[in-house]
Interface confidence: low
């Protein structure tokens, strides 16, 4: 089976992880999407999901996680605000499409949160000021209870697109794989 790769992000407590999952509009715009954590030897656990059907640009907040699905751009934005050391772990974005198994991304996110503040370029010193800029009209969505056993034992089939070049070889209507665009501050 193809081995899933990981991208490691090291952030400080109080900062915000900001991930954008780039998906095929034609196929997945209204599909329910979710943010999952993967613990060693366990099934992926869904931490937050969009509504079903997913609503355009409508923030869904579950605790410190905010999901926003931008249908026009084929982007699911996932934010984990006010990061804590205990948030460290392995995460992934998935698209639900019952009764089929969820579609998963090829690069999982290995998040490492440490104490203290960083002033390095690419991290935002003022990120804690953004933590509370959450729209008041957020909703909580019920997530499907099932998770796919495949995520523990084998990787999904290899995408036809290069992970670092979203859509570079993607047909508008015939694609079943999704590609993640990682961003964080």
């Amino acid at each position: 089976a193809t081995k899933l790769t990981e991208e490691k992000y090291e952030l400080k407590e109080g900062q915000t992880l900001d991930v954008k999952c780039d998906y095929t509009l034609e196929k997945f715009a209204s599909s329910q999407k979710a943010w999952q954590i993967i613990r060693d030897g366990e099934m992926p656990k869904t931490l937050a999901c969009t509504e079903r059907p997913s609503k355009n640009s409508h923030p869904v907040q579950v605790g410190r996680i905010i999901l926003e699905d931008y249908h026009d751009h084929g982007l699911l934005r996932v934010r984990m605000v006010n990061l804590q050391v205990e948030d460290s772990g392995l995460y992934q974005c998935v698209i639900y499409q019952p009764p089929k198994e969820p579609h998963m991304l090829f690069d999982r996110i290995r998040l490492v949160v440490t104490k203290g503040f960083s002033g390095t370029p690419g991290s935002n010193e003022n990120s804690t000021q953004n933590v509370y800029k959450i729209p008041p009209t957020t909703t909580k969505a019920l997530c499907p209870l099932y998770t796919s056993p495949r995520t523990v034992t084998q990787a999904p089939p290899k995408s036809t697109a290069d992970v670092s070049t979203p859509d570079s070889e993607i047909n508008l209507t015939n694609v079943t794989d999704i590609i993640r665009v990682p961003v964080f501050n």
Epitope: L25, E26, A29, L75, N124, L172
Partner: antibody, heavy 121, light 113 residues
Framework: QLQLQESGPGLVKPSETLSLTCTVS??????????WGWIRQPPGKGLEWIGS???????YYNPSLKSRVTISVDTSKNQFSLKLSSVTAADTAVYYC?????????????WGQGTLVTVSS | DIVMTQSPDSLAVSLGERATINCKSS????????????LAWYQQKPGQPPKLLIY???TRESGVPDRFSGSGSGTDFTLTISSLQAEDVAVYYC?????????FGGGTKVEIK
């Protein structure tokens, strides 16, 4: 008013690396709403997309140039940069930096004035 | 890559007359899920960078005169200048942003007859 300004050498020798910097003023490059891109235009010809970057450093490169291109960002200076290695005369062009919207599938709404880079020995 | 083909290459129109530029994409840039065409139009005057005129195929950018309009869907698009003014002399480019890499048309040069 947002302004973008390209800077860098106007003459580069073949096989060397072209390096350009785009300085953004009138707005923060760290805004979570925008991507930033490089586009080039050979003299008398059309426009070609080179690549784009998010303030965090997440990049997209045109596959036709991917093996030679590096785009980076320096949020502390409100700048992003382009490096194009192993240049040839075919890389002679006006290089523009531009602001994009929130997502890869978006137009360029603010452009720098452009800088002409000539590849010649 | 999606190939964008513009026609004509150049166009000479009398002041006050209508100018029409065509752009054809090698595959559809319309997504049925949101019924949006991922196409933009730019104007480039000599010695200047391109200026955004139209996005989503027909939405005018803020500050663009209403004599500029965009139309079309799927693979065939048109930029129309309803009443050509002297300041409209420029090269016009279409660009698709449905699939990366973004690609531009070859440009149409608009001159005064």
């Amino acid at each position: 008013q947002l302004q973008l300004q390209e800077s860098g050498p106007g003459l580069v020798k073949p096989s060397e690396t072209l390096s350009l910097t785009c300085t953004v003023s009138g707005g923060s490059i760290s805004s979570s709403s925008y991507y930033w891109g490089w586009i080039r235009q050979p003299p008398g010809k059309g426009l070609e997309w080179i690549g784009s970057i998010y303030y965090s450093g997440s990049t997209y490169y045109n596959p036709s140039l991917k093996s030679r291109v590096t785009i980076s960002v320096d949020t502390s200076k409100n700048q992003f940069s382009l490096k194009l290695s192993s240049v040839t005369a075919a890389d002679t062009a006006v290089y523009y930096c531009a602001r994009l919207g929130d997502g890869y599938r978006i137009w360029a709404d603010y452009w720098g004035q452009g800088t002409l880079v000539t590849v010649s020995s | 890559d999606i190939v964008m083909t513009q026609s004509p290459d150049s166009l000479a129109v009398s002041l006050g007359e209508r100018a029409t530029i065509n752009c054809k994409s090698s595959q559809s840039v319309l997504y049925s899920s949101n019924n949006k065409n991922y196409l933009a139009w730019y104007q480039q005057k000599p010695g200047q960078p391109p200026k955004l005129l139209i996005y989503w195929a027909s939405t005018r950018e803020s500050g663009v005169p209403d004599r500029f309009s965009g139309s079309g869907s799927g693979t065939d698009f048109t930029l129309t200048i309803s009443s050509l003014q002297a300041e409209d002399v420029a090269v016009y480019y279409c660009q698709q942003y449905a699939l990366t890499p973004y690609t531009f048309g070859g440009g149409t040069k608009v001159e005064i007859k």
